[in-house]
Interface confidence: medium
């Protein structure tokens, strides 16, 4: 923070009287420095009334004064009011003012269109001091003007919180038309009307627009900017541009392609990413979208078996992510797969068909009609069954797994037997007498072990008991059969 001490000093009116003398034209500036803009008001000497001295609030230092002279009215000198120049040319303009030396804390700044020009390197302030006044010339230069330099420039000087403002200097940068809106590429439906817009500005104005289609002018008479071209419809792709003309010359917009929407090209590179017994994961590379975004895709699957009825399964999916898992397929089967995608116009042709196979799976059903009986003479248990239906084997049978559990007086023991695929019977030795034997059978393929059949129980009596009867898989819903002999 700073404090200003007021004191009795040179008494004189604030802005009265004529200009005391004139500025010599052969003066050279004692100082030239880049203009520090962005001034803020600060404490400065401000007479309370013309002709009245100040009374300070601290000890007053002795001042031997130069003889007082009347001060001139403070105003910027008139200068050029309007500068018209071409783009990329250089320009320099200035404002000048003579300020009594008492105002050693004034501020001078450049403003453009109401905004202060801060840190402007192209502003230079030159000072020409004399005994009583200092002539100030604030220059502003732009080496290569651009359209953005157009505007109204003023100088401001702040003295005692009063602002002195120069007359505005209007800078008008003229050049070729400058596009503010150019036509944009579009994808349109065949024979459907659409609009294109083109807008360009000067100065100089006016700016006139001509439309060009495939290198030929569309309109004989120019339209004043902005211009909207209505195209009634196209049957094939076309390139449009617009020409903007003013007194300085012509500017041509970028050429934009107008495409006609069509059905997509078929997908390419359909490939198998992964196969299981009942599903296939496929991917594809989408074809050209026909200038209209893909909506969805269709996966067509047919059995490759020549004996199949040739029916086609269809799976619909979204266009992204070019990946689909086809489910509910048969194991160890061959399929032909094709993909088609659609946009707003219609469906593409189907991609080239590819062959794919599901892998071998574990059987999906257990062996049927399991029966168990005791062969007491040989002390064996005979087991018979029917193999699962071929379609539900989900692969080539390699055998069966037999689980037999022996339970007697709180003791339980499970044994597993593997038997070959030939035949549909097996014989197991009696492990424990006076016990219950529970038998379950599962079919086995290279794909794994299928589900076990429902348990069939048979009671194995102590030696010397009478005859017996077989036990078999119960009808669904019945309790587990137990045969006690």
């Amino acid at each position: 923070a700073i404090t200003e001490a007021r004191e009795e000093a040179k008494p004189y009116p604030l802005f009265p009287g004529p200009f005391p003398g004139s500025l010599q034209t052969d003066h050279t500036p004692l100082l030239s420095l880049p203009h520090a803009s962005g001034y803020q008001p600060a404490l400065m000497f401000s007479p309370t009334q013309p002709g009245r001295p100040h009374t300070g609030n601290v000890a007053i230092p002795q001042v031997t004064s130069v003889e007082s002279k009347p001060l001139p009215p403070l105003a910027f000198k008139h200068t050029v009011g309007h500068i018209i120049l071409s783009e990329h040319k250089g320009v320099k303009f200035n404002c000048s003012i003579s300020v009594p030396n008492i105002y050693q804390d004034t501020t001078i700044s450049w403003w453009k269109d109401g905004k202060e020009l801060l840190g402007a390197h192209h502003a230079i302030t030159q000072f020409y001091p004399d005994d009583e006044v200092t002539a100030i010339i604030a220059s502003f230069s732009i080496t290569s003007v651009q359209r953005s330099d157009n505007g109204s420039y003023i100088c401001k000087m702040k003295i005692n919180n009063e602002e002195i403002v120069s007359d505005p200097i209007y800078i008008e940068v003229q050049g070729l038309p400058h596009f503010t809106k150019q036509p944009e590429s579009m994808n349109v439906t065949r024979n459907t009307a659409f609009n294109l817009t083109c807008q360009a500005v000067g100065p100089p104005e006016p700016v006139n627009i001509f439309w060009v289609q495939n290198s030929s002018r569309v309109n004989e008479q120019p339209e004043k900017s902005p211009s909207v071209l209505t195209v009634p419809g196209l049957t094939e792709m076309a390139v449009f541009s617009c020409e903007a003309h003013n007194d300085k010359g012509l500017t041509v917009s970028k050429g934009v392609q107008i495409n006609i929407k069509a059905i997509p090209s078929p997908p390419t590179e359909v490939s198998i990413r992964n196969s299981t017994a009942h599903s296939i994961l496929i991917s594809w590379v989408p074809g050209f979208d026909g200038y209209s975004p893909f909506r969805n895709c269709s996966i067509q699957v047919k059995e490759a078996d020549p004996l199949s009825n040739g029916s086609v399964m269809i799976f619909n999916t979204s266009a992204l992510p070019h990946l689909y898992q086809i489910k509910q397929l048969q194991a160890l089967a061959n399929y032909s797969i094709g993909v088609s995608c659609m946009n707003e116009i219609g469906w593409s042709a189907v991609s080239p068909w590819i062959l794919a196979s599901t892998t071998e799976g574990a059987p999906s059903v257990a062996p049927l009609n399991v029966t168990v009986f005791l062969n007491e003479s040989s002390d064996n248990v005979d087991i018979r069954w029917m193999k699962p239906p071929t379609k539900q084997q989900d692969g080539e049978l390699v055998g069966y797994r037999i689980s037999h559990v022996w339970q007697s007086a709180g003791i339980s023991k499970e044994l597993l037997e593997e038997v070959g695929q030939n035949g549909s019977r097996a014989r197991i030795s009696v492990q424990v007498h006076n016990a219950t034997c529970t038998v379950r059978i599962a079919a086995v393929t290279r794909g794994g072990v299928g589900p076990f059949s429902d348990p069939v129980k048979i009671f194995i009596p102590a030696h010397g008991w009478v005859d017996y009867a077989p036990s078999s898989t119960p009808a669904p819903g019945n309790a587990d059969p137990v045969l006690i002999i």
């Epitope: 200003e4 001490a5 004191e7 001034y39 030396n101 001091p129």
Partner: antibody
């Protein structure tokens, strides 16, 4: 050429006063504000404030209010710095420095005096 | 008040070296920074003002750059007569000096 010549070194006792002078030549004295800057031993530079050489109005920064007075004798183009009730911490080199711009809120110093050493010791 | 942080506080370099000193302000100072050279027992000498404007008569090996809060003073090829203390001054809001950089020859 433009120059500022300051008075010689001073050795003072605590409580005394000292007056340092700064004589300008080679330019219009009343056109450029004059600042004072303190450089204590082993310390950086500290701006003390400035005086309007035309009106004689001084402006002091917070650290230099009360015992410090800026004054002028424009007839001999001289600025003065007076320090009263001297303390040991006033021991420093004091520079006068001309403001580089005649009219500007923001200024730097383009010409400096050679400095005056003030030593306060009992 | 605006603080100016100058670094390094001292620096040793060889003749012909490129020397760089930085000043960082506590807020944007609108490029209002000047750089001074002070030799022992002498008055400071203005080298650069307004960030990069070289004072008339100052050799072109001295330069300044920066904006916002970060400013750099450079001596492109150090000469024996450049041995001095250098300091920055911000003059955007009141006046604040940097602490100074003492430059010595290796």
């Amino acid at each position: 050429q433009v120059q500022l010549v300051q008075s010689g070194s001073e050795l003072k006792k605590p409580g005394a006063s000292v007056k340092v002078s700064c004589k300008a030549s080679g330019y219009t004295f009343t056109a450029y504000g004059m600042s004072w800057v303190k450089q204590a031993p082993g310390q950086g530079l500290q701006w003390m404030g400035w005086i309007n050489t035309y009106s004689g109005v001084p402006t002091y920064t917070d650290d230099f209010k009360g015992r410090f007075v800026f004054s002028l004798d424009t007839s001999v183009s001289t600025a003065f710095l007076q320090i009263s009730s001297l303390k040991a911490e006033d021991t420093a080199v004091y520079f006068c420095a001309r403001r580089a711009a005649v009219v500007a809120k923001y200024w730097y110093f383009d010409v400096w005096g050679q400095g005056t050493t003030v030593t306060v010791s009992s | 008040d605006i603080q100016m942080t100058q670094s390094p506080s001292s620096l040793s370099a060889s003749v012909g070296d490129r020397v760089t000193i930085t000043c960082k302000s506590s807020q944007d100072i609108n490029k209002r920074i000047s750089w001074y050279q002070q030799k022992p027992g002498k008055a400071p000498k203005l080298l650069i003002h307004s960030t990069s404007s070289l004072q008339p008569g100052v050799p072109s090996r001295f330069s300044g750059s920066g904006s916002g809060r970060d400013f750099t003073f450079t001596i492109s090829s150090l000469q024996p007569e450049d041995i001095a203390t250098y300091f920055c001054l911000q003059y955007d809001n009141l006046l604040t000096f940097g602490q100074g950089t003492k430059l010595e020859i290796k």
